[in-house]
């Protein structure tokens, strides 16, 4: 027993206060990160607090403003982009959000040499995507689903595509499903390294069924939003990849890149494009049944002005136990010979590791190994490879940055971050300058986040970029909850959990328990990161214990855990939450009559199924924007994990895994169902069907809809949502208001 001096009579203790819901809703304890906008090996741009764009030179220690806040304000710019020849800056204003990544905006081009905006041949508005070439100051942009090219900002545009049509043909930008579930970007065009070629995707959504929902707005009649959205088993977009020579775009026009024969024989997806050199490109393709991926390296044939993808340069990645890759199939990082590459995929023991592929995947050289996973390759230089993993001290929810010396044999490995600020920092990402001359480390916790600048050769810390001093001071008089990350061993499965405990936690007392769940395939909730959020408040002020559990289907602990849910979503994720709750009860400090569960999106699905599990464990629960049947969700995501909803494939489990099928089981729990009516992602249809099934079963429940809100329930809806959920939980747990 460790006796610690009590702070109860300490005068400092009396000034300490619990978190309030208002603190959370106001974002009082939000943190800042610093990601340099690198423009060379030793220079970066950063937008200062007063909105000047400042150039920092690490080696001289000097900085100067290249674009004043006055210029920014003159067009109400919220973002900027410097051309690689440093002659121009685009200024972005009138930001208008579309889906998760996509937005439209108005763009102005400012000439830094003369301090004036470029007049003549101004850009149309609104633009869907705009970017500089990697060299010089060519511009590519997408307007009304067509791609345009400018050799210089003041020049007239050259139109590359002509078939673009709203909701039908998308050029250079993804349709809904590719944006959300495959590319995770707002763009689908890629410049070659020196700007000679421009590659782009064309998505044909002509035959895709459309989801339609009402947007109520303020008018007499609601608008109808129509989105081509392929649900599980439906017709998918047809994708084609083209490449155009940007120096002579009219010469031969766009050239299509051939699809590998083994991919083209049935429905398929394009998953990513990586330029290797100006005349070599790497495309990744995926069968609709997503356990076979093909990486195809293509070369420009000068004589024919076409792209050739020899079968000898096709590399197949196949999974026999699940789907290909983790959440996405990983992308290659090419080495300096422009043919060999580094890539993360499963090793023979079922852990995702870095492999070096020189000729064939079969002859791949494994670079990392162990019962942990390599997560991201940041940079490969002539002599070093930088990557992140969760190896250190065997905590899957940590991220440290490692350097492997690939210039020496045998390669030596060094953890760059493991011992830097060990207590404060256990979850890092990194941002590298050209040739990894310098890099920034961004630490997300578990302590207060901090961003630092480092020398790429010695790893020496040069300076602190952002240490969140104001946040640190603001938290000095706050009673934050205690957090612990531990694991449960159950039937050969390791269940990692994070427990958030009230500030004066006493193991001899009984506390209400709230489970927060996400649980989607290849997700991770138990992470060593800093957060002051709603659940922090519930522990700090309302005295609840909150637990997050990573069960089967979650990531970065090997394929056995990850692929356990393959073709049977909604079973083991729920079982593992229930198992964990039983273990928490055994710990002795949980009031088993006051246990709740809540989740959002996939978490709303899991929380609904847990409430309807018939265990009697949960008194109440909340589902925000839940999936209720996998037949209602997007093809690309759903089929990756569930296969097709056809009789000869997996229709039976699609039917068995719905929330509606368990309507009767909600009779003995208090259920709060919440959804935005303009959810483009998990359609309101999901909650409408749950509500209908509950009504038909004559089961009482509570519900809240948010008019015209999407999957994020942002703005004032957020405040209303968390206030509403707080009241619901306090009532459930018999806590006074």
């Amino acid at each position: 027993i460790v006796l610690r001096p009590s702070r109860v009579h300490n005068s400092e203790e009396n000034t300490m206060r619990a978190l309030t819901l208002k603190d959370i809703l106001n974002g009082t304890f939000s943190y800042k990160t610093f990601f340099p906008n690198w423009i060379s090996g030793q220079e970066y741009l950063h937008q200062s607090a007063d909105n000047n764009i400042v150039l920092y030179n690490i080696e001289t220690g000097q900085s100067y403003t290249i674009l004043s806040n006055r210029t920014m304000k003159s067009v109400n710019a919220s973002n900027y982009g410097l051309s690689p020849d440093r002659q121009f800056v685009y200024l972005e204003s009138d930001y208008s959000k579309l889906w998760r990544y996509s937005y439209t905006a108005t763009y102005y081009i400012y000439d830094l040499s003369n301090g004036e905006f470029v007049r003549g041949n101004e850009l149309p508005r609104p633009i869907q995507y705009l970017c500089w070439s990697p060299v010089g100051s060519k511009l590519a942009y997408v307007y009304q689903n067509n791609i345009y090219l400018k050799q210089r900002p003041g020049d007239p545009p050259f139109q590359i595509t002509f078939n673009g049509r709203e909701n039908k043909i998308f050029n250079g930008i993804p349709d809904w499903v590719y944006e959300e579930e495959m590319l995770a970007t707002k763009y689908a065009l890629w410049w070659s390294p020196n700007g000679k070629f421009l590659a782009y995707a064309e998505f044909n959504d002509t035959d895709i069924p459309v989801i339609a929902y009402s947007y109520y707005g303020d008018e007499q009649y609601p608008r109808t939003i129509n989105i081509p959205y392929p649900k599980a088993g439906a017709k998918n977009p047809v994708v084609r990849i083209f490449i155009i020579d940007t120096t002579y775009p009219a010469y031969v026009g766009p050239q299509e890149v051939p699809v590998p024969a083994m991919i083209a024989s049935s429905d398929y997806y394009f998953s990513w494009l990586t330029w290797v050199t100006d005349e070599r490109v790497c495309l990744q393709w995926l069968k609709r049944v997503q356990n076979v991926s093909v990486l195809s390296i293509c070369d420009f044939r000068e004589d024919w002005q076409t792209w050739d993808c020899p079968k000898t340069q096709e590399h197949i990645e196949e999974s026999r136990t699940g789907w290909a890759g983790g959440f996405f199939v990983s992308t290659p990082v090419f080495s300096y010979d422009a043919i060999s590459y580094y890539k993360i995929f499963s090793d023979k023991d079922g852990y995702k590791h870095i492999h070096y592929i020189k000729d064939t995947v079969e002859n791949a050289i494994q670079i990392t190994s162990g019962k942990w996973e390599a997560i991201n390759i940041f940079r490969v230089t002539q002599d070093s490879l930088f990557y992140s993993s969760n190896e250190f001290e065997e905590y899957p929810g940590r991220r440290n940055i490692y350097r492997i010396s690939i210039g020496s044999y045998p390669p030596s490995k060094k953890c760059v971050t493991c011992h830097l600020r060990k207590e404060r920092c256990q979850y890092y990402t990194a941002s590298f300058s050209d040739y990894a001359k310098y890099y920034a480390l961004v630490c997300y916790g578990p302590g207060i986040p901090i961003s630092t600048l480092h020398d790429g050769r010695t790893d020496q810390e040069i300076k602190i970029l952002e240490e969140n001093k104001e946040l640190e001071n603001a938290l000095k008089n706050i009673q934050l909850p205690k957090e612990e990350i531990k694991k449960l061993e159950v039937d050969e499965i390791t269940l990692w959990y994070k427990m958030i405990l009230p500030p004066q936690f006493d193991r001899s007392k009984k506390y209400p328990l709230l489970i927060q769940v996400y649980g989607g395939p290849c997700s991770q909730s138990v992470r060593s990161v800093f957060a002051v959020n709603w659940i922090s408040y519930l522990a700090s002020k309302e005295g609840m214990v909150i637990a997050l559990v990573d069960g089967r289907g979650t990531a970065f602990q090997g394929d056995k855990l990850l692929y356990a849910v393959y073709r049977k979503l909604g079973v083991y994720e729920v079982e593992d939450q229930i198992t964990a709750v039983r273990k928490f009860i055994e710990m002795g400090f949980i009031d088993e009559k006051r246990i709740a569960i809540w989740g959002w999106s996939y978490g709303g699905y899991v929380s609904s199924l847990a409430l309807a599990s018939g265990t009697g464990l949960f008194k109440c629960g909340i589902a925000v924007a839940p999936v209720s049947s996998w037949e209602y969700y997007a093809s690309v995501y759903t089929e990756r994990f569930m296969g097709l909803p056809t009789k000869d494939d997996n229709l039976e489990h699609y039917k068995n895994s719905t929330v509606m099928a368990r309507a009767e089981y909600f009779r003995n729990v208090d259920y709060l169902l919440i959804h935005g009516t303009a959810d483009d992602n998990v359609h309101f249809q999901n909650s409408a069907q749950i509500a209908k099934a509950l009504v038909n079963a004559q089961v009482d429940f509570q519900a809240m809809w948010y008019s015209d809100q999407n999957h994020g329930l942002s703005g004032l809806s957020t405040n209303h949502l968390y206030t509403h959920m707080t009241h619901f939980l306090k009532q459930c747990f018999s806590l006074s208001d």
Epitope: N57, I66, R86
Partner: nanobody, 117 residues
Framework: QVQLQESGGGLVQPGGSLRLSCAVS????????MGWYRQAPGKPRQWVAG???????NYVGFAKGRFTISRDNAKNTVYLQMNTLKPDDTAVYHC???????????WGQGTQVTVSS
């Protein structure tokens, strides 16, 4: 205080050559990206060429193949070798950081280049 002193301009016939120099003081030239800019009468100033701290040159379209930017870090000087000059190249040539500072930054007097027969 950073100071920039350009020299080497003059009158030259079309097709001729000039080598401009820019002496830099008050900063470590070797660590800064530097650029040459020009301003013709009644026209806005425009960028001509830039050089990174690693010595890599970048050029605007009209300068490619005719102009060469270089640096001598020991002498704290940046150069612009201009060949095959045309009457259109007539302007006052300035050097500065690349990109230049905003507002009313330090610009030297510049050096006048006149291409005429």
């Amino acid at each position: 205080q950073v100071q920039l002193q350009e020299s080497g301009g003059g009158l030259v016939q079309p097709g001729g050559s000039l080598r401009l120099s820019c002496a830099v003081s008050g900063t470590m030239l070797s660590r800064n990206a530097m650029g040459w800019y020009r301003q013709a009468p009644g026209k806005p100033r425009q960028w001509v060429a830039g050089i990174t701290s690693d010595g890599l040159g970048n050029y605007v379209g009209f300068a490619k193949g005719r102009f060469t930017i270089s640096r001598d870090n020991a002498k704290n000087t940046v150069y612009l070798q201009m060949n095959t000059l045309k009457p259109d190249d007539t302007a006052v040539y300035h050097c500065n950081f690349w990109p230049p500072p905003s507002g009313r930054p330090i610009w030297g007097q510049g050096t006048q280049v006149t291409v005429s027969s």
